[in-house]
């Protein structure tokens, strides 16, 4: 008789999850000299230990502490780029602007980017069939708790001017329920962070509106100001040109507004 298995609403663990995490760890440590002493076997053991044999709706930040310790990494605190609902462009930007970092440019973010994982209570098995959905099942699931933990730490580390890339094509340009809105905004440290600068990325070719006047941006400004952090906002009307100008700042067309 097959053992009864909990059916969750979300997709199951990404196939070849252990192999993917280990391979990514080795690749990352190879590329980043300051992380070459990292023991990827220990990293995987700590990652696994955070969720294996535990109920996937009962995961805590504490479960991830060994992994957080192993992934401790110093990034320049004044070179942090946060993003919300516009990951691809943020990553394209830091691939060009090599001295700036998104969370996924750190070891822990790189390991988990685009992956799903969960286990089962009291068994050492990884659940490849289904994992809890944040909305439909539970918020304290392995993936959500991981991203909440690393996002909090990343925001806490930031200093000086922090940039955030926001998607101007969405109905809520700033969404209080996003990881940025619910975690990162509230964990920026006012004693270290002087300014949060939002870059609102326009989607349409002919979109010339000032999206910095959007009500949700005003809401973000209000939250940030109440936390004693200055706020500034820029429209990025042409994201393609924006990236091109980051690559080639000397280009004559890069003096005009992008």
């Amino acid at each position: 008789v097959p053992r009864w298995r909990q059916q969750w609403s979300g997709p199951g663990t990404t196939k070849r999850f252990p192999e993917t995490v280990l391979a990514r760890c080795v690749k990352y440590t190879e590329i980043h000299p300051e992380m070459r002493h990292v023991d990827c076997q220990s990293v995987w053991d700590a990652f696994k230990g955070a969720f294996i044999s535990k109920h996937p709706c009962n995961i805590t930040e504490e479960d991830y502490q060994p992994l957080m310790k192993l992934g401790t990494q110093t990034v320049p605190c004044n070179k942090i780029l946060l993003w919300s609902r516009i990951k691809d462009l943020a990553h394209q930007f830091t691939q060009v602007q090599r001295d700036m970092f998104t969370l996924e440019d750190t070891l822990l973010g790189y390991l988990a980017d685009d992956l799903t994982w969960c286990g089962e209570f009291n068994t050492s098995k990884i659940n490849y069939q289904s994992c809890p959905d944040w909305r439909k099942d539970c918020s304290n699931n392995p993936v959500s708790v991981f991203w909440k933990t690393v996002s909090r730490r990343f925001a806490e580390a930031a200093c000086d001017v922090v940039h955030v890339m926001l998607n101007g094509s969405r109905s809520k340009i700033f969404d209080k329920n996003s990881t940025f809105g619910s975690v990162e905004v509230h964990n920026l440290q006012p004693e270290k962070v002087q300014t949060l600068e939002a870059w609102v990325i326009h989607g349409g070719r002919e979109d010339s509106r000032d999206l910095c006047q959007d009500p949700t941006i005003k809401e973000l400004e209000s939250i940030i100001s109440k936390r004693n952090i200055q706020f500034s906002c820029k429209n990025i009307y042409r994201p393609d040109k924006f990236l091109q100008c980051v690559k080639n700042p000397e280009d004559s067309s890069c003096t005009s507004e992008i």
């Epitope: 760890c25 080795v26 440590t29 190879e30 000299p33 070459r36 002493h37 990292v38 023991d39 990827c40 076997q41 220990s42 053991d45 700590a46 060994p66 310790k69 192993l70």
Partner: antibody, heavy 121, light 107 residues
Framework: QVTLKESGPALVKPTQTLTLTCTLS??????????VGWIRQPPGKGLEWLAH???????RYNPALKSRLTISKDTSSNQVFLKIASVDKEDTATYYC?????????????WGQGTLVTVSS | EIVLTQSPATLSLSPGERVSVTCKAS??????VAWYQQKPGQAPRTLIY???YRYSGVPARFSGSGSGTDFTLTISSLEPEDFAVYYC?????????FGQGTKVEIK
């Protein structure tokens, strides 16, 4: 098979610079992911990590000795060198080189047999 | 720097006995610990890495355990060739450090 062999002067005078050589075989330091480190052991005492160097010339030093240490490599001869400046009696030790690998942590899977260096006038 | 304290300094035992050597780190190193065996006049030899993984070719009687600050090397049944000095090493952070060693001698 993988082997490492240390060589250097058996005797050096205080204040001189000691140069040690680690000759590698069975693997190449031009191969991605490989590194070689130096560890020493004073007579009757424990082990001390000194420095290591990676295939791409990234170097790491023990902060307590950093000002006196220089690690380098010659890929063509498959050798790694360690220079210790201004030696004194406390530098008398058996010096080992060992291999490390990216992604495995900095533990030493392979060791040379060691070379004993005495600092004396 | 992280200080590793091994205990005991010396163990006097007979072949066939079980051995436990402990290594205590001055701060949490998760599982980034290796164990080495060193015989007189020889270089150290790797036994255990990542706290609990036996290195290739190492007999099954050797095992490692622990995480955080407390680690143990166990030899389930001492063989005559196991009489040696055992060192732990942390590679969690620079500078990498070793314990002072534990000598396992014949009683």
């Amino acid at each position: 098979q993988v082997t490492l062999k240390e060589s250097g002067p058996a005797l050096v005078k205080p204040t001189q610079t000691l140069t040690l050589t680690c000759t590698l075989s069975g693997f190449s330091l031009s191969t991605s992911r490989m590194g070689v480190g130096w560890i020493r052991q004073p007579p009757g005492k424990g082990l001390e990590w000194l420095a290591h160097i990676w295939w791409d010339d990234d170097k790491r030093y023990n902060p307590a000795l950093k000002s006196r240490l220089t690690i380098s490599k010659d890929t063509s001869s498959n050798q790694v060198f360690l220079k210790i400046a201004s030696v004194d009696k406390e530098d008398t030790a058996t010096y080992y080189c060992g291999r490390i690998e990216v992604g495995r942590g900095a533990w030493f899977a392979y060791w040379g047999q060691g070379t004993l260096v005495t600092v004396s006038s | 720097e992280i200080v590793l304290t091994q205990s005991p300094a010396t163990l006097s035992l007979s072949p066939g006995e079980r051995v436990s050597v402990t290594c205590k780190a001055s701060q949490d190193v998760v599982t980034t610990v290796a164990w080495y065996q060193q015989k007189p006049g020889q270089a150290p030899r790797t036994l255990i890495y990542s706290a609990s993984y036996r290195y290739s070719g190492v007999p099954a009687r050797f095992s490692g355990s622990g995480s955080g600050t407390d680690f143990t090397l166990t030899i389930s049944s001492l063989e005559p060739e196991d009489f040696a000095v055992y060192y732990c090493q942390q590679y969690y952070t620079y500078p990498f450090t070793f314990g002072q060693g534990t000598k396992v001698e014949i009683k």
